[in-house]
Structure formats: structure tokens, C-alpha cells
């Protein structure tokens, strides 16, 4: 059985301010078990954008129904994009751990660029 990989097929995405950005991510396996999280940026200061396990992320919706037991599509949509949302977004697979989940694999990242609304 091949080891799980996280695929972010888009190196970059350009979205007009006020529109919705779609950030694509798929996993190549269902195992090991553990949640997917999305971050903006890398390293210790990265910003959590979406956590499959818990939390309230009003601007974020998932493209697929994550309650399907065979789901491997973890793409998200972020609504009402502003220039402040620009940055590189990473889809990260965690494996279950105790007491905390452990980062297992990250996608290569998708750079979101925001085109200002014409005045």
C-alpha cells in the first residue's frame, strides 16, 4: 500500500476581490486516520483557515461532503475575498495522536492572489 500523499494541483489562483476562491486538495489514501487542516503560510506563525475536526469558520465551505466515509477531496471555498487574504495556502494531513494529532503530510501549497476591484 502506497503512503498517503496530499495533492494541491494548483500552484496559484487569482481571484477578484469580493469573489469566492476555490483551493483544491485531495489525498491519495484514507489511511492513516486523522483530520485535514488548511493553513495560510508556513512555520510556527501560520494561520489556521479550516479544521475538519472542530471550530467555526464562517467564510469557509468544503467542496465535497466530508461526512462521506470514502471522501478524499478536501478542497475548500473561501468567500468574500479581500486583498488581506493573499498568501500561500497549505492543505495538511494529520495522523491521530495522543494527546495531540501529529502533522503527517502537507501539500505543496497554492498561492492566492487577489485582484483589486476596479474603481
Amino acid at each position: 500500500e502506497e503512503e498517503l500523499q496530499v495533492i494541491q494541483p494548483d500552484k496559484s489562483v487569482l481571484v477578484a476581490a469580493g469573489e469566492t476562491a476555490t483551493l483544491r486538495c485531495t489525498a491519495t489514501s484514507l489511511i492513516p486516520v486523522g483530520p485535514i487542516q488548511w493553513f495560510r503560510g508556513a512555520g510556527p506563525g501560520r494561520e489556521l483557515i479550516y479544521n475538519q475536526k472542530e471550530g467555526h469558520f464562517p467564510r469557509v465551505t468544503t467542496v465535497s461532503d466530508l461526512t462521506k466515509r470514502n471522501n478524499m477531496d478536501f478542497s475548500i471555498r473561501i468567500g468574500n475575498i479581500t486583498p488581506a487574504d493573499a498568501g500561500t495556502y497549505y492543505c495538511v494531513k494529520f495522523r491521530k495522536g495522543s494527546p495531540d494529532d501529529v502533522e503527517f503530510k502537507s501539500g505543496a501549497g497554492t498561492e492566492l492572489s487577489v485582484r483589486a476591484k476596479p474603481s
Epitope: 489511511i31 492513516p32 486516520v33 483530520p35 475536526k53 461532503d65 466530508l66 462521506k68 466515509r69 495522543s98
Partner: antibody, heavy 118, light 109 residues
Amino acid sequence: EVQLVESGGGVVQPGGSLRLSCAASGFTFSSNAMSWVRQAPGKGLEWVAGISAGGSDTYYPASVKGRFTISRDNSKNTLYLQMNSLRAEDTAVYYCARETWNHLFDYWGQGTLVTVSS
Amino acid sequence: SYELTQPPSVSVSPGQTARITCSGGSYSSYYYAWYQQKPGQAPVTLIYSDDKRPSNIPERFSGSSSGTTVTLTISGVQAEDEADYYCGGYDQSSYTNPFGGGTQLTVLG
């Protein structure tokens, strides 16, 4: 407050059919996967069906596959279990349960008793 | 037959610590939970995701995992803890929810 209320249980003859319902309240029903779990008298718990939040995907153990059908109506906040070709060994209390993000159960209904007997 | 294995019974004196183990699932494809059931009542979820406790469950209930075995620990057991305890799982490799056969906890005295 999360509430799950089952109904539809009763006595049915072997080979007969029954449809159970579970009315959900206190949470966004359309966002959660749901399951049915049963317990035969004096026995342990047995999972019998699961369904995704949108209702498109269903899951069953071998013991009931082809006889039981789980479904849901998100506009009515209601979960269903259609049971056909019932056997004596299907006699049990049937519980509906809400699933967590990773398909474990966090809330349970009080259960409804199904008795299959001639 | 049950896919997960747990002892049929455990006895403990009030104030002591009870431990119930459960095994049978692959670590990489399983999540575990613990459910308490008192006679004539519906199950109540004590632990989910191997070791997470819902906010309404007393702190004396805790879960831990080591390899393919998970353990429910009840510290400072009280008479009201006398019940059946079920280990349940989610198996990502088969999309199923197996249970253990249940453990009857008896509080002595």
C-alpha cells in the same frame, strides 16, 4: 440541547417490514452523518447502518445488507430505517445516533423496541 | 462475535481505579470511543477519538491508547459508575463501526 427521538417500533411477524423514524433537534441535522445501532435483549451493541450528511452515501454491515435501508429527509430533520425480511434475530432496541467528524457516536436517542415474533 | 475484545467483567472497590481495555483494531485505520450504559437506559458517550472527553462527562473518566489497545480509566470509582461499558470503533478500512462485547463494572461493597 441535542435531542434524538425514535419511533415506529412494534411487533412484526418474521418476513415482515417496519420503518423506524428518528426526529432530530438542537443541532444542524443536515451537517451531521447519522447511524442506527441496535441492542438485542441482554446482548451488546451492534451498528446496523450509517448515512452521510447529504444522504447520498449509505453503509451497512453484512448482517443487514440488502434487507435494511437507511435514509434521511434533511428538510424534516428526520432519519429513517426501513427494515424488510425481518427475522427473529432482528429483535432489539434500535437507537439512532449522531456521528462525530470521524464517525464515532456522540449523542444517542432513547431507543425504540422492535420485536419479530409469530 | 465481536470484532473488538474487552473483558466481560471488572470489579473494583469504591474510591479505587478501574481500568477496562479494548483491542482488535489497527492503529492506523481505527478511532475508538467508550460508551456507558446503565440498565434500561440508552448509551452515553464517555470518550471519543481514543482519548477525548465530552464537556459533560466527569474528569474521573479518561481514555488512553497504546498501539492497538485503548484503555478506559475510571479514577475514584463511585457506586453510580456501576454499569456496562462498551468499546466502539470506526474502521476506516471497511467503513464500519465495530463494538466490543461490553464490560460489566461492579462496584464492591
